[in-house]
Structures are given as C-alpha cells and as structure tokens.
Interface confidence: low
Amino acid sequence: FNISGCSTKKLLWTYSTRSEEEFVLFCDLPEPQKSHFCHRNRLSPKQVPEHLPFMGSNDLSDVQWYQQPSNGDPLEDIRKSYPHIIQDKCTLHFLTPGVNNSGSYICRPKMIKSPYDVACCVKMILEVKPQTNASCEYSASHKQDLLLGSTGSISCPSLSCQSDAQSPAVTWYKNGKLLSVERSNRIVVDEVYDYHQGTYVCDYTQSDTVSSWTVRAVVQVRTIVGDTKLKPDILDPVEDTLEVELGKPLTISCKARFGFERVFNPVIKWYIKDSDLEWEVSVPEAKSIKSTLKDEIIERNIILEKVTQRDLRRKFVCFVQNSIGNTTQSVQLKEKRG
C-alpha cells in the first residue's frame, strides 16, 4: 500500500546500556468516527481529529504493523521478521534495546471499512541510541519500586537529569491509558496501592530549528511490601508422625511460606537423621506454588521408592531458611497396623 499519505511522528528512544529496558510504540491513529477507523479526508481544516495513543475502540485493537526497510525494499510484516518485537493490540513492544531497532514503523487498520480508510495509517520514525551522558544514567531507573501504603513517586527516566523547574510538559500513560492529569516529570503517589503497579510511559517533545520529535521512556513500576521480619514458617507437614505401609512408595511434601524480601534467596531442603548421622537428601527441585505481594509458598518433596524397616528408625527433617532465620519440621514414619 502507498504510505506517502500516512501521518508521520518522530520518536527518540535513549536507552540505558545497563538495563534490559523495554520500549513501546502506540498506533496513534486518529479517533475513529462512528464505526470507521478514520476519515481524515472528510475533515475540514478546522476539524482536527483527537489522537488517542491507546485505542479505546474494539475496532482498533486489530491493526497491522510493518517496518520499512532502509534500502527501499517492500514493507515487512513485523510479526514475521522480528522475534524481539511483540504486537499487543495497538501497541508494539520492543523487548530488547539496541540501535538496530531504529527505523520506520507503519501501522494501519487490518480492516478497511471505506475507501477513505486507505490512507489511514501512521508512520513512526524511531531513532534509538544509547545513553551517552553517564551521569544521567544515575538519575532514574527503568524499574522503580513503590512501597504499599506509603507515599512515593514515579520519575520519568529521560527527564530525571533536569530540575522540575526546567522540565517540559510530560504526557504519561499507564498500562496503555492516558493519565490526563499528570503533566510533570514525576508522578507523586500519596498512598501506594497494588493497582499502582504496571507499565508507565512518559513522553515529552523536543525541538530544534528543523523539526520536533517525541522523547519516550518506559518505566516498569512494581508495588512491594517491606522486607519480612519473620523467618519462614512450615505449613506442611504439620504432624511429626506419618503412618506408612512398608514396601510402598512414599512422597512427603514440605510446604513453607516465605515473606517478601527484596533480595529473595529462600532455602528449602530435606535431610535425614539416623542415630548420630545426618545427611542432606537429593530431592526434586523446589517449586513455587503460590506467589503474592506479601509472600511466596514454596514446596519441595522427598520421594522414597519404597519404605523400608530402616526408614522407620529415621527422622525426615524439612529445613527452611531466609535471611532472618530458619525453621525445621521433622517427621517420624510409623508402620500402619491392620
């Protein structure tokens, strides 16, 4: 299709060389009028269409993205040629930074509903370059933590080297929705709730004598609780004896709850005590069976191919530990009678 009629937008992505940061492009098609995508040709000069960076219309969730090769080759379908770029509805997600992401990206509706829609497309010229001002690297991270229940703020990484006074107007989005109230380089959160977690995008316009372009940064915000002050607790086994049948296989599960820790390094293991001897058992890997903001439940099983008489004299001990301390629970096997 002919892209000469596409509206054009220039964007700059200055990425931090030490972050696996992400980037997004929105299909900034003009707001659909009624059931159509856009009728730019029908508008009088005074009727400027409102741009919606994230389309609210269901129609607009179905757009096609292309990249325009610099050598003049035909447009390439993003989904076929670029595994590190993912399309999600109207948004194009770049999973890895790099100057090789520079180029022209075109989006248009998949379904053309009227002859006027043929020229309904947006061409985004993306320039990608590494952050060269090393001191600016230190200002705001592309991953930011907010503590639940307290105050906090989300800073726009590309603007954090500037003072609030000299900062230009910023457009913020959260999980694809325009945050129309926010215009400064920091979003101040009076009280942090779990819904503040998400992907934030901040845009501002930069101009020189020739042209203007949008500088964009993406911030992943996670809401966290304070580090636990408790050692982990063992949820299972509860009893210290377990009835078993000799000669049969047996699996004993150890489930433990670990409170949130910023640096999470849980230990969960089984060992066997036999009179004066004690040794750790090689058992299957631990697995997380439930994870919430406040804690995580981890399970690890010990598997006996068949219970022997010797096993009845042993104690099977589950040991769990975090940075605060450790907890143990021992199980003695007892032969089932009758």
Partner: antibody, heavy 124, light 107 residues
Framework: QVQLQESGPGLVKPSETLSLTCTVS????????WSWIRQPPGKGLEWIGY???????NYNPSLKSRVTISVDTSKNQFSLKLSSVTAADTAVYYC??????????????????WGQGTTVTVSS | AIQLTQSPSSLSASVGDRVTITCRAS??????LAWYQQKPGKAPKFLIY???SLESGVPSRFSGSGSGTDFTLTISSLQPEDFATYYC?????????FGQGTRLEIK
C-alpha cells in the same frame, strides 16, 4: 545528576553515638534504597545497612544492635546513628544508592552512586 | 554471611599487561556479583554488575566472568589510570559482603 554528600562530626568520643547525615541532591530520594558502608584505615569495605525511602531497613547482623538508619524524605536526607562506639569504629563512612538494574525477570542491585566519604575518628 | 575471598591480595604489573583478579564465594551466589574500583582517597566506582555486564562508560578493556562461586575480573591491557584497589561484592543474600580487595600496583 544524583550526588550524595555525607556530613557529621569527624571526632567522636568512645561510648558515645556517631551521627552522620547523607544529603541527596540532583534527584529524589523516593523509590530507591540507600546504604551506608564504612572502610577502616587501610582495610576493606563493610556494608552497615540500607533504608528504603519509606523507612524499611536492613542492617548487617554484626552491627545490628548498635545501628539505626532513618530517612527524611522532605529534606532528601538519610542518616546513620551508631551507638557505643569504640576505636574499632574509626573509619571512612560512605553513603551510597542501591539501584535496581532491570534484568529480565528480576532486579539486580548495585551501589551505583557514592558520596565522597567522611572520616570519623573515635578517640577521647 | 557469605564470604568473598579475592586473590591475589596485591599484584604488580606494567602498562599494557593483561591482569586477572579472582573472587571466590563461600557458597553459590548465582551471578549476583559486582566489581568496584577504588583509588586512594576516593569512593569506590562501580564497574561491573551481574558478574559480567559492563557499566556504561567503563572502558571495554575491563571484563568480568563467572557464576556460582568463582568469578574473575580481567583487564586486557593495563592503562596508567587502572592502578587502584579492586573489590568484588555479592548481592545474593544479606548481609551484603565485599571481598578484602586486590591492590594493583605499578611494577
């Protein structure tokens, strides 16, 4: 550009409390973890503890009974108090920022910005 | 606490030499290791994170490798400004610990 500046008395008497403040300029104290580290003369680095902007703390067990780290977000400052000092606490004290570097599925923390350090001598 | 042992404690080398400093952890720390450079009278400067990722602005002659318990910092061709003390630091579990340092001197 974020900069850190330690301040406080350079001389403290034995058994007294050492008090230092770190002022953060060029950026907000919010959303970050802030650490204190010390270095006795001619020796290596020892992590004392960190504080999150909200006030959550984590201390080195070897110093835990004597350490208090606090934060004042309105002043963009965080502070260290070390009680019952002895000559062994003589050191250069540094404040630093712990920044989360975004690895794919987790955060990897390093101390990326440091103050220039302040020398504290414990002597009568 | 996880102990980090650096070797050698000090070494003498000349400009242009290739030098390697090792850091061994008392238990596995995955790749949660950073390297810092410290010059006399100055604060440490962060060089490498996650065992092998180079901080922005750090010359490419510096490289890190390793995972688990054994890590190395290599300077491929020493420059005059590289003579300093180097520390490794683990962030795998609390308390955060540093190696005792390796002093790199001019031969």
């Amino acid at each position: 550009q974020v900069q850190l500046q330690e301040s406080g008395p350079g001389l403290v008497k034995p058994s007294e409390t050492l008090s230092l403040t770190c002022t953060v300029s060029g950026g907000s104290i919010n959303n970050y973890y802030w650490s204190w580290i010390r270095q006795p003369p001619g020796k290596g680095l020892e992590w004392i503890g960190y504080i999150f902007y909200s006030g959550t703390t984590n201390y080195n067990p070897s110093l835990k009974s004597r350490v208090t780290i606090s934060v004042d977000t309105s002043k963009n400052q965080f502070s260290l108090k070390l009680s019952s000092v002895t000559a062994a606490d003589t050191a250069v004290y540094y404040c630093a920022r712990d920044v989360g570097i975004a690895a794919r599925n987790s955060y990897y923390y390093v101390m990326d910005v440091w103050g220039q350090g302040t020398t504290v001598t414990v002597s009568s | 606490a996880i102990q980090l042992t650096q070797s050698p404690s000090s070494l003498s080398a000349s400009v242009g030499d290739r030098v390697t400093i090792t850091c061994r952890a008392s238990q596995g720390i995955s790749s949660a290791l950073a390297w810092y450079q410290q010059k006399p009278g100055k604060a440490p400067k962060f060089l490498i994170y996650e065992g092998s990722s180079l901080e922005s602005g750090v010359p490419s002659r510096f490289s890190g490798s390793g995972s688990g318990t054994d890590f190395t910092l290599t300077i491929s061709s020493l420059q005059p400004e590289d003579f300093a003390t180097y520390y490794c630091q683990q962030f795998n579990s609390y308390p955060i610990t540093f190696g005792q340092g390796t002093r790199l001197e001019i031969k």
